[in-house]
């Protein structure tokens, strides 16, 4: 019949429904570089996976243009406040695009998690979750940054993570 | 034409697009058991529903293998801190699989919500949200746990909940 | 062949897969009205977009019946606590439906972000994230409310936002 081309596309699409781009990356010992760069992530071991998205130096890279729900959680914790800590911890998702020289803020949270500077002896924990829909072109990248990253707690990939899926 | 079998599959898939597995379960008076088990949930009344997922003793059960965005929010609150409260409240999503005897941590948050033990007279509120993409095989289950669950506040199903959908 | 009608539907659906309803609205200077109404949102500039959903006076309006993952984040912050502030900040997503005269609570968080009233000199930040799956009929609306909205911080649309997509 005359539907050949479209038919093949539909068959392909049916198969690739299970290939809707998605990823979940997990925190690892190497996530915190101290270099001022974005957090780095585990892409294969344990709960981590990439399906239809690429990874490069901390960034999820879109292979297919469209709208993506992107998310990240970071586990914060400490005993009192480290010296020199600003009153704000900033956790954000940022886009890198060839069309613009600087990273673009997408989703950002600010928190004051560690209480007063005088309570130096107190163990505290806090968590920051971000999620939202953004548009990505092919080759555009999303990264996670935390300032001050000294407060990010990593253990087994369940407490700090980064992911996305096409909507 | 020769596309019969595939055609039926495509028609079926078009119909079942609206049956993409999804669920949203809500907190109820019976959610907190005090038994050390996971939280239990309302599956039918009010905002709660199951579509292509099953429920069993607090667990969402996958009927179809694939990647799911799973999420949970718990409302925490109290007047001061309860006796015996650790400095950490842990809120987590855990997987149960026939392939492994113990629950597997998927997504976890730790928080120190209720301030210092000395502030016994102070009403406080906090909320913990978790969400992320995980792979589930048919029959695998996801549950929510909160330690210490004495701090979870239930009222009308809007403040503490648990859900998932296939991505 | 005899599949004509259905074929057109399938072709249409393949094309409209990219038109799965989705939206992401961002906070703007005009978001906080002080009128007791819901928060208002930017729908076009910057990261904001509407795809298969409408917007009206702060509300996302469903054009297609189904289950939607709806979400909102608000950035809270201040220096101490404003006079008259209740000990609780409530951040919620609410449904408006022609079938019921009052707004229906969907997803709600309560937080005590600004510490004790005596700590008036301290800058603090906190963030509240909500997300969950709800059913919307055509014409039903979802809005975001924050009580007390005086504590919502707006800057560039990345810290306070509101979105949805069909699942």
């Amino acid at each position: 019949d005359g539907h050949g081309g479209s038919w093949e596309q539909l068959i392909q699409e049916r198969r690739s429904h299970q290939n809707n781009p998605a990823a979940h990356l997990t925190g690892a010992n190497s996530s915190l570089t101290g270099s001022g760069g974005p957090l780095l992530w585990e892409t294969q071991l344990g709960l981590a996976f990439l399906r239809g998205l690429d990874y490069h130096d901390g960034a999820l890279v879109a292979n297919k243009a469209g709208y993506y729900y992107i998310y990240s959680k970071v586990q914060l914790g400490g005993v009192g406040c480290p010296l020199g800590l600003a009153s704000t911890i900033t956790h954000g998702l940022y886009k890198r695009t060839p069309r613009y020289p600087e990273e673009l803020e997408l989703l950002v949270s600010q928190q004051s998690p560690c209480g007063r500077a005088t309570s130096n002896s107190r163990v505290w924990w806090d968590s920051s979750f971000l999620g939202g829909v953004v548009h990505l072109e092919v080759g555009e990248e999303v990264v996670v940054r935390v300032l001050d990253e000294r407060l990010v707690r990593l253990r087994d990939g369940t407490r700090s993570y980064f992911g996305a899926f096409m909507v | 034409d020769g596309h019969g079998g595939s055609w039926e599959q495509l028609i079926q898939e078009r119909r079942s697009h609206q049956n993409n597995p999804a669920a949203h379960l809500t907190g109820a008076n019976s959610s907190l058991t005090g038994s050390g088990g996971p939280l239990l949930w309302e599956t039918q009344l009010g905002l709660a529903f199951l579509r292509g997922l099953d429920y069993h003793d607090g667990a969402l059960v996958a009927n179809k293998a694939g990647y799911y965005y799973i999420y949970s929010k718990v409302q925490l609150g109290g007047v001061g801190c309860p006796l015996g409260l650790a400095s950490t409240i842990t809120h987590g999503l855990y997987k149960r699989t026939p392939r492994y005897p113990e629950e597997l941590e998927l997504l976890v948050s730790q928080q120190s919500p209720c301030g210092r033990a000395t502030s016994n007279s102070r009403v406080w509120w906090d909320s913990s949200f978790l969400g992320g993409v995980v792979h589930l095989e048919v029959g695998e289950e996801v549950v929510v746990r909160v330690l210490d669950e004495r701090l979870v506040r239930l009222r009308d199903g809007t403040r503490s909940y648990f859900g998932a959908f296939m991505v | 062949d005899g599949h004509g009608g259905s074929w057109e539907q399938l072709i249409q659906e393949r094309r409209s897969h990219q038109n799965n309803p989705a939206a992401h609205l961002t906070g703007a200077n005009s978001s906080l009205t002080g009128s007791g109404g819901p928060l208002l949102w930017e729908t076009q500039l910057g990261l904001a977009f509407l795809r298969g959903l409408d917007y009206h006076d702060g509300a996302l309006v469903a054009n297609k019946a189904g289950y939607y993952y709806i979400y909102s984040k608000v950035q809270l912050g201040g220096v101490g606590c404003p006079l008259g502030l209740a000990s609780t900040i409530t951040h919620g997503l609410y449904k408006r439906t022609p079938r019921y005269p009052e707004e229906l609570e969907l997803l709600v968080s309560q937080q005590s972000p600004c510490g004790r009233a005596t700590s008036n000199s301290r800058v603090w930040w906190d963030s509240s994230f909500l997300g969950g799956v709800v059913h919307l009929e055509v014409g039903e609306e979802v809005v975001v409310r924050v009580l007390d909205e005086r504590l919502v911080r707006l800057r560039d649309g990345t810290r306070s936002y509101f979105g949805a997509f069909m699942v």
Partner: antibody, heavy 121, light 111 residues
């Protein structure tokens, strides 16, 4: 069934200390707070404090802080209340009581039979 | 601390009649839709016995003639039809914050 059995009556001199025990049975000892309440002859009820046997955490009425010490022994499911620097106005019946699991509703659903402590020179 | 004031100090009622006991708190004891007020009965030589918890919930094993009501700062214990075994001292207790405090008691006596 839930039972709280207290030690016997005590007579003490002013300035001395007394240690009253409360043995619990019929429930998971480490899951519930145990509170101590006293009642002077012909008077009302006064809360002294509570202990969480799960980890030994304690909370005291400021009035008794420094004089009362609450402890729990998981191996014997027994809670102890020690009151030091006794004075005549400490003469009272001392009760242990189990607190509800859900801490915000700290009602006392089971009580010991009471221990009379008499402080007299 | 939260002060609880019970009234009357003594209440004389005939068997079969209704008894209403009052308890007022110096500040609200409400939290998240619940009122953290409890009621106990005490007979001579016995420990107190829990009747009502969180203002209106009847403890298991307690006869249905006992009921509790109120919110905020004002609470009531009602005994709908007094039986001979109900004559005792009744205490209210707040569990909103520590120190947990009791009212001074209401003595319910036979008229």
């Amino acid at each position: 069934q839930v039972q709280l059995v207290q030690s016997g009556a005590e007579v003490k001199k002013p300035g001395a200390s007394v240690k009253v025990s409360c043995k619990a049975s019929g429930y998971t000892f480490t899951s519930y707070n145990v509170h101590w309440v006293r009642q002077a002859p012909g008077q009302g009820l006064e809360w002294i404090g509570a202990v969480y046997p799960g980890n030994g955490d304690t909370s005291y009425n400021q009035k008794f802080k420094g004089r009362a010490t609450l402890t729990a022994d998981k191996s014997t499911s027994t809670v102890y209340m020690e009151l030091s620097s006794l004075r005549s106005e400490d003469t009272a019946v001392y009760y242990c009581a189990r607190g509800s699991y859900y801490y915000t509703s700290s009602y006392f659903d089971h009580w010991g039979q009471g221990t009379l402590v008499t402080v007299s020179s | 601390e939260i002060v609880l004031t019970q009234s009357p100090a003594t209440l004389s009622v005939s068997p079969g009649e209704r008894a209403t006991l009052s308890c007022k708190a110096s500040q609200s004891v409400d939290f998240d839709g619940d009122s953290y007020m409890n009621w106990y009965q005490q007979k001579p030589g016995q420990p107190p016995r829990l009747l009502i918890y969180t203002a209106s919930n009847l403890e298991s094993g307690i006869p249905a003639r006992f009921s509790g009501s109120g919110s905020g700062t004002e609470f009531t214990l009602t005994i709908s039809s007094l039986q001979s075994e109900d004559f005792a001292v009744y205490y209210c207790q707040q569990s909103y914050e520590d120190p947990f405090t009791f009212g001074q008691g209401t003595k319910l006596e036979i008229k």
